[in-house]
Interface confidence: low
């Protein structure tokens, strides 16, 4: 048909911290490069119906539906969502092209739908329609990476069973300690499944999907490292399978080593060698343990024997739930104003727990490091003085934690003052807890000193503000008061702060008329 | 902790039906979200249909649409899978599956959290 427009449907998908998302439906700020959506004319329709590619959109994502109409003159629109039109302004492009656009912010249940664009242009009337589904990850799962060697081969497998398919990584490092962290320029990442180098000192595998990203560090005793003081300890789950490594180096290859589990020699078969020479013509040999599927009986000290280098041993216990080990009591701070701070936890968990700081209903990111000891912490340091309560929630596939923090600002006491008709309030939120005094300032008292004892009604910690508790004070009015001024004081262990009230004789009360 | 005991599977012939129930111990059955799983013997377990806490949203793989209906009753703690239409492509162990404890429909956690036993379903003339 002649007479049709060409016309392109686009979805921009926008940034989660894209601030200009939503600033105008009519000017959608791209933050993204648009998707073609195709637009194709739908086959056997009444009326010329194009019909958009569908979009599956994450929970909380935002998009931008967008039609750019190549036809000429003006165009007139309207949207129709679940029977409901919506307002539609189109405006036009540096190629002089209609654009009309529909903004998702922030995409829910309530959101998914058919999306109508009725747009009349001056030569034809013209229907597109856009179908928007949520994303279904209902149903998604992200496990951790398990080993298992590679048949007839010296080779290590990586496998998570997660859902979609996750990309499988293997991240190796040669360094020690701090010069492994994922950033460092030491770390060499490879995005396959089989590992043949199972020489280097730290080697993990990671798998991602669209839920994140999980990794298993495989568990190596270094028979040249001097032993940790405390014994290296290996958690698993029954079923789940068993893999250490020992690695030795030495002057020549004039040297064996043997697994032992609780001084019994391992089976043949649940365990295999391989050897390297190194550039410095030293040999390396590895030795790994492994145990296809661990049982109950497969727990007790694994030790890894040298001809020469001393033994060496780890601690493997086999538990039939996961579990978090920590003490949930809640606990109570009490710092000055710019004194350093930070939160910490201290905890022994498996499988490795996801974990978050929550503070006035807001959620930080939440870093855990391993101890030593078999044991990990994780710290908060980003309270920003802010007095309230703090709340540290771990998880993982067995079990759940949830620890409390409240932290108090020591800070002299600031008084904000109301009045009313009948009463006159302060209120303060100083730490310690602030004591309340008020005082009539009359001819007999210029300096406020007489103080008021009667009708005075104070509530400790009456109410809290994102954990932080506010302390009133409140004078019930009588004659003998009406129309002087009266000071409230707050008072702490830092210091005093007071407010003047004007209790007003009757008339336009609390107001002062300013002659 | 919430266990799941599948129910229901059997022999049927191709362009028969079938329903398959699922029993949920634990008072929290309600706040889950549901599925049901599939696996062919000497394939992957694949993703059937799952149904939203309320049950106002359900979800399908393509191979089973139209075909297959997913529903719950949450005052009985059992989930349901109404199957029509068999076909021989359809045998495999289902499995029942309890999502993660939200409220929400969708979510981005990992979320499959605990598994049934399974039952077979055998499609065969």
């Known amino acids: 048909n002649q007479d049709l427009p060409v016309i392109k449907c686009v979805l921009i998908n926008h940034k989660n911290n894209d601030s200009s998302v939503g600033k105008s439906s009519s000017y959608p700020m791209v933050s993204e490069s648009p998707e073609d959506l195709g637009c194709a004319l739908r086959p056997q329709s009444s009326g010329t119906v194009y019909e958009a590619a569908a979009v599956e959109v994450d929970v909380s994502a935002s998009i931008t539906l967008q039609v750019l109409v190549d036809a000429p003159g003006n165009i007139s629109c309207l949207w129709v969502f679940k029977h409901s039109s919506l307002n539609c302004q189109p405006h036009f492009d540096l190629q002089n092209r209609g654009v009309v656009s529909m903004v998702i912010l922030k995409m829910t249940e309530t959101q998914a739908g058919e999306y109508l664009l009725f747009i009349q242009s001056e030569a034809t009337n013209y229907t597109i329609l856009f179908t928007v589904s949520i994303r279904n990850t209902l149903l998604y799962t992200l496990r951790r990476p398990y080993f298992r060697k590679m048949e007839n081969q010296d080779a290590l497998v990586c496998i998570s069973e997660s859902v979609p398919e996750p990309i499988v990584e293997w991240v190796l490092c040669d360094s020690q300690g701090e010069s492994c962290k994922e950033e460092s320029p030491a770390v060499v990442k490879k995005e396959e499944k089989v590992l043949h180098e199972l020489f280097g000192t730290d080697i993990r595998c990671c798998a991602r999907n669209e839920l994140g990203r999980e990794c298993t560090r495989l568990f190596t005793i270094d028979l040249n490292q001097t032993p940790q003081t405390t014994l290296p300890q290996l958690f698993l789950k029954v079923g789940e399978p068993l893999w250490i490594r020992c690695k030795a180096v030495h002057v020549n290859h004039g040297f064996g080593l043997t697994w032992e589990l609780e001084n019994k020699a391992l089976e043949e078969g649940n365990y295999f060698e391989m050897s390297t020479y190194s550039t410095n013509r030293t040999m390396i040999r590895i030795l790994f343990a492994f145990v296809s599927s661990v049982a109950r009986n497969d727990t007790g000290y694994y030790t890894c024997s040298s001809s020469k280098h001393p033994s060496q041993s780890a601690l493997v216990t086999i538990v039939e739930k996961g579990f978090i080990n920590a003490t949930n009591s809640s606990e109570d701070y009490e710092i000055d104003q710019y004194e350093e701070f930070c939160f910490s936890v201290r905890f022994k968990a498996y499988p490795q727990i996801r974990c978050t700081w929550t503070f006035s209903r807001k959620s930080f990111p939440c870093e855990q490091k391993g101890l030593d000891n078999g044991y990990s912490i994780s710290k908060f340091c980003n309270h920003k003085h802010q007095p309230g309560e703090y709340i540290f929630h771990a998880e993982n596939d067995d079990a759940q934690f949830t620890k409390m923090f409240t932290l108090n600002i020591r800070r002299k006491p600031q008084v904000l003052a109301e009045a009313s008709a009948s009463q006159a309030s302060c209120f303060s939120d100083g730490y310690p807890l602030p004591s309340w005094t008020w005082k009539k300032c009359s001819d007999k008292s210029p300096n406020c000193t007489e103080e008021i004892t009667e009708g005075v009604w104070n509530r400790k910690a009456n109410r809290k503000v994102f954990g932080q508790w506010v302390s009133s004070s409140t004078l019930n009015m009588s004659e003998a008061i009406k129309g002087f001024l009266v000071k409230c004081c707050a008072y702490n262990s830092l210091g005093t702060s007071c407010e003047t009230i004007l209790l007003n004789s009757p008339g336009p009360f609390p107001f002062i008329q300013d002659n | 902790e919430v266990q799941l005991l599948e129910s229901g599977g059997g022999l049927v012939q191709p362009g028969g039906s079938l329903t398959l129930s699922c029993a949920a111990s634990?008072?929290?059955?309600?706040?889950?979200?549901m599925g049901w799983f599939r696996q062919a013997p000497g394939k992957e377990r694949e993703f059937v249909a799952a149904?939203?806490?309320?049950?106002?949203?359900?979800y399908y793989a393509d191979s089973v649409k139209g075909r297959f209906t997913i529903s719950r009753d949450n005052s009985k703690n059992t989930l349901y899978l109404q199957m029509n239409s068999l076909r021989a492509e359809d045998t495999a162990v289902y499995y029942c599956?309890?999502?993660?404890?939200?409220?929400?429909?969708?979510?981005?956690?990992?979320?499959?959290?605990?598994w049934g036993q399974g039952t077979l379903v055998t499609v065969s003339s």
């Open positions: 599956a309890a999502g993660g404890s939200t409220r929400v429909v969708v979510t981005t956690t990992p979320v499959v959290k605990y």
């Open positions: 634990g008072r929290t059955f309600s706040s889950y979200a």
């Open positions: 149904i939203s806490w309320s049950g106002s949203s359900t």
